[in-house]
């Protein structure tokens, strides 16, 4: 089936926005006013995955860019990266596992768990201007809770 997608922005629970930091990295920082235009707009696609009544599998692409967040092992550690894809073939309903995140909604907050690496989550640091990364702990120093803002197409 044609994949269903929506455009959105994400902010962590401390209200930090996500912006590009170089060609293949995202960072989280507080933005205000006109600077809000810097935040990345995601194209969130609803894909096949190990869906449950609590988890919805999604892929997170950057709107109008052929870049997707993906999870891979680097030096034996699950790592978040921005991966370039062929725009003719993506997005698709049957995304490879490294591109899939389980979107989990708890108390109006969202978590994004890697399908490839269960219990590893899209995370931000408490500190300003630090890279968005894949973290293996929840409820610690690092932030794994996000809110989603819909963006009209």
């Amino acid at each position: 089936a044609p994949v269903r997608s929506l455009n959105c922005t994400l902010r962590d629970s401390q209200q930090k926005s996500l912006v590009m930091s170089g060609p293949y990295e995202l960072k989280a920082l507080h933005l205000q006013g006109q600077d809000m235009e810097q935040q990345v707009v995601f194209s969130m696609s609803f894909v096949q995955g190990e869906e449950s009544n609590d988890k919805i599998p999604v892929a997170l692409g950057l709107k109008e860019k052929n870049l997707y967040l993906s999870c891979v092992l680097k030096d034996d550690k699950p790592t978040l990266q921005l991966e370039s894809v062929d725009p003719k073939n993506y997005p698709k309903k049957k995304m490879e596992k490294r591109f899939v995140f389980n979107k989990i909604e708890i108390n109006n907050k969202l978590e994004f768990e890697s399908a490839q690496f269960p219990n590893w989550y899209i995370s931000t640091s408490q500190a300003e201007n630090m890279p968005v990364f894949l973290g293996g702990t929840k409820g610690g120093q690092d932030i794994t809770d996000f809110t989603m803002q819909f963006v009209s197409s």
Partner: antibody, heavy 122, light 107 residues
Framework: QVHLKESGPGLVAPSQSLSITCTVS????????VSWIRQPPGKGLEWLGL???????YYNSPLKSRLSIRKDNSKSQVFLKMNSLQTDDTAVYYC????????????????WGQGTSVTVSS | ETTVTQSPASLSMAIGEKVTIRCITS??????MNWYQQKPGEPPKLLIS???TLRPGVPSRFSSSGSGTDFVFIIENMLSEDVADYYC?????????FGAGTKLELK
């Protein structure tokens, strides 16, 4: 060789709960999901829900409040529990293995057990 | 939820005849349709998996076609051993949904 076998009580009294065990061999429950399906006498197939390799579950909405699926990976067993049974829950209950091929056919089912017949009657 | 409408409900065919069963889905499911055969007292057996792929060991007289919302299952030359119930299953999205089934009998 993939094999699934259901074992259940046969007869259940109305308003009581049903417990069925699916014992599998030839594949690991950590790698593949298992679905439950039922078939009332002379009728068609109804998909009840599934448990994935990682342990997450998905229940079909009409039965969600009455269903529970869990598993024991080390014993290669999947358990279906259904509460508050009524006569229209009389059916053959099947477990089936998910194909679980990422990026290809995640939701399809290939191998089925023989089924266990459950009659709800006082 | 994707609804699957299967037709006909029953078929009476002579040996050697061509059998055609159709399933229509309420949403576009690409090629994610599966076809099962069920004989009395037995569990369903997967004949054709998504992508119109014949399963290993299944005779070549069985085939299917279709994508999107319209799917057809064909038995090219019916044999007596093909008497059974046949079901389609969409595996595009959860919850998985079956067609109501087609009872194939011998004329």
């Amino acid at each position: 060789q993939v094999h699934l076998k259901e074992s259940g009580p046969g007869l259940v009294a109305p308003s009581q709960s049903l417990s069925i065990t699916c014992t599998v061999s030839g594949f690991s429950l950590t790698d593949y999901g298992v679905s439950w399906i039922r078939q009332p006498p002379g009728k068609g197939l109804e998909w009840l829900g599934l448990i994935w390799g990682g342990g997450d579950t998905y229940y079909n909405s009409p039965l969600k409040s009455r269903l529970s699926i869990r598993k024991d990976n080390s014993k290669s067993q999947v358990f279906l529990k259904m509460n508050s049974l009524q006569t229209d829950d009389t059916a053959v209950y099947y477990c089936a293995k998910q194909r679980t091929l990422w990026g290809y056919d995640l939701y399809g089912m290939d191998y089925w057990g023989q089924g266990t017949s459950v009659t709800v009657s006082s | 939820e994707t609804t699957v409408t299967q037709s006909p409900a029953s078929l009476s065919m002579a040996i050697g005849e061509k059998v055609t069963i159709r399933c229509i889905t309420s949403t576009d499911i690409d090629v994610d349709m599966n076809w099962y055969q069920q004989k009395p007292g037995e569990p369903p057996k997967l004949l054709i998996s998504q992508g119109n792929t014949l399963r290993p060991g299944v005779p070549s007289r069985f085939s299917s076609s279709g994508s999107g919302t319209d799917f057809v299952f064909i038995i090219e030359n019916m044999l007596s051993e093909d008497v059974a119930d046949y079901y389609c299953l969409q595996s595009d999205n959860l919850p998985l949904t079956f067609g109501a089934g087609t009872k194939l009998e011998l004329k």
